[in-house]
């Protein structure tokens, strides 16, 4: 079996963590978040070729069926395996509050 | 805000549970599984338009950035939110064994 972390499509082409710089406006948050003004958003981007970072048995099945029926079954998709928490300083009706979100920034990625 | 379960692309076009009939050969299991001979594989297929079954804050961010930078950031993707377990009767060196897999069949779907 191919090494599950070696990308057969070339360096950086397969499912991995990327960082995208975004403003509050980019995120659609300007009306309800005060800080941070800008976010380094970590997200999972890239192709999921066979056996690459397969999350589970379902991902294996999906890849096998995709090869058989590519028009019916899509290839596995690169999604977060876990997340890093982030605190936002939010506007409220009465002022501001701190809110921690556990599902905002991807920490690592896999194919499902 | 649009109803998170109403598909704006038309019935059945958005992220939802599909069933795909597959044989052991289709799944690549013929050499290590005895039963079942055929599987009704439930999997998540379909588009993830804005606000449709968004799994979490990360999915919202991803959609907003996808609209801004479609060549850099892909749209959210339709993946299992949970799984149904399934038991397989497996071949072993000495005969057969029962093995339950918790991550084989999708139970419901969301966009990440």
């Amino acid at each position: 079996a191919r090494n599950g972390d070696r990308c057969p499509l070339g360096p950086g082409r397969c499912c991995r963590l990327h960082t995208v710089h975004a403003s509050l406006e980019d995120l659609g948050w300007a009306d309800w978040v005060l800080s941070p003004r800008e976010v380094q958003v970590t997200m999972c981007i890239g192709a999921c070729p066979s056996q690459f970072r397969e999350a589970n048995m379902h991902a294996q099945i999906k890849m096998n069926l995709h090869r058989l029926k590519p028009d019916t079954v899509p290839a596995p998709c690169c999604v977060p395996a876990s997340y890093n928490p982030m605190v936002l300083i939010q506007k409220t009706d009465t002022g501001v509050s701190l809110q921690t979100y556990d599902d905002l920034l991807a920490k690592d990625c896999h194919c499902v | 805000a649009r109803n998170g379960d109403r598909c704006p692309l038309g019935p059945g076009r958005c992220c939802r549970l599909h069933t795909v009939h597959a044989s052991l050969e289709d799944l690549g299991w013929a050499d290590w599984v005895l039963s079942p001979r055929e599987v009704q594989v439930t999997m998540c297929i379909g588009a993830c338009p804005s606000q449709f079954r968004e799994a979490n804050m990360h999915a919202q961010i991803k959609m907003n950035l996808h609209r801004l930078k479609p060549d850099t950031v892909p749209a959210p993707c339709c993946v299992p939110a949970s799984y149904n377990p399934m038991v397989l009767i497996q071949k072993t060196d000495t005969g057969v064994s029962l093995q339950t897999y918790d991550d084989l069949l999708a139970k419901d779907c969301h966009c990440v």
Epitope: V87, L88, I89 | -
Partner: antibody
Framework: QVQLQESGPGLVKPSETLSLTCTFS??????????VGWIRQPPGKGLEWLAH???????RYNPALKSRLTISKDSSKSQISLKLSSVTAADTAVYYC??????????WGQGTTVTVSS | DIQMTQSPSSLSASVGDRVTITCKAS??????VAWYQQKPGQSPKALIY???YRSSGVPSRFSGSGSGTDFTLTISSLQPEDFATYYC????????FGQGTRLEIK
């Protein structure tokens, strides 16, 4: 519920190094945007920011005191230490540990009094 | 560094009075200003963030305004528990505080 508890020696001799510890709970320093800082207040005077350490291990120091300050976090991530070297009587103050959310000093500890005297 | 100059340094007022404390930055700090309240023998408490947003649990009689270099903290109707020292702070560059305004009972 956020809690910060400062601990220190109480009395330090001139020219020695002051070591302070902040033990915190109710938040995680591995959360993006979180930080822990130190602010001091000499008797009867105003507030002076000393240093802070952020979730990503970035450290910031007051330029006027930078050469004398060292901030660090314990591997358990629930303790922050501050060292101030070559102390003089001017370093006598109440030292506060503060939770930072991004750039805001959101929650303050009760403070620990440090006197520099021989 | 950015200097924050508060005025007045102290003032006397009565319960029910409207009180305004001003803070002037030595250079433009946008709205990157916070206000804190400190009662005798206690640690400071966050009141206002981003010039005008009240911290959670702060009564509505406290309000902040301003941007650029000029900022104000207003207490619309003084209550007995409001007699304290108030500090402004900028976080546009490394943090600096005003010298404080002591609010006393007349």
């Amino acid at each position: 519920q956020v809690q910060l508890q400062e601990s220190g020696p109480g009395l330090v001799k001139p020219s020695e190094t002051l070591s302070l510890t902040c033990t915190f709970s109710g938040f995680s320093l591995s959360t993006s945007g979180m930080g822990v800082g130190w602010i001091r207040q000499p008797p009867g005077k105003g507030l002076e920011w000393l240093a802070h350490i952020l979730w990503d291990d970035v450290k910031r120091y007051n330029p006027a005191l930078k050469s004398r300050l060292t901030i660090s976090k314990d591997s358990s991530k629930s303790q922050i230490s501050l060292k101030l070297s070559s102390v003089t009587a001017a370093d006598t103050a109440v030292y506060y540990c503060v939770q930072m959310a991004w750039d805001w000093f959101a929650y303050w500890g009760q403070g620990t009094t440090v006197t520099v005297s021989s | 560094d950015i200097q924050m100059t508060q005025s007045p340094s102290s003032l006397s007022a009565s319960v029910g009075d409207r009180v305004t404390i001003t803070c002037k930055a030595s250079q433009n700090v946008d709205t990157n200003v916070a206000w804190y309240q400190q009662k005798p023998g206690q640690s400071p408490k966050a009141l206002i963030y981003s010039a005008s947003y009240r911290s959670s649990g702060v009564p509505s009689r406290f309000s902040g305004s301003g941007s650029g270099t000029d900022f104000t903290l207003t207490i619309s109707s003084l209550q007995p528990e409001d007699f304290a020292t108030y500090y402004c702070q900028q976080y546009h560059s490394y943090p600096t505080f005003g010298q404080g305004t002591r609010l006393e009972i007349k």
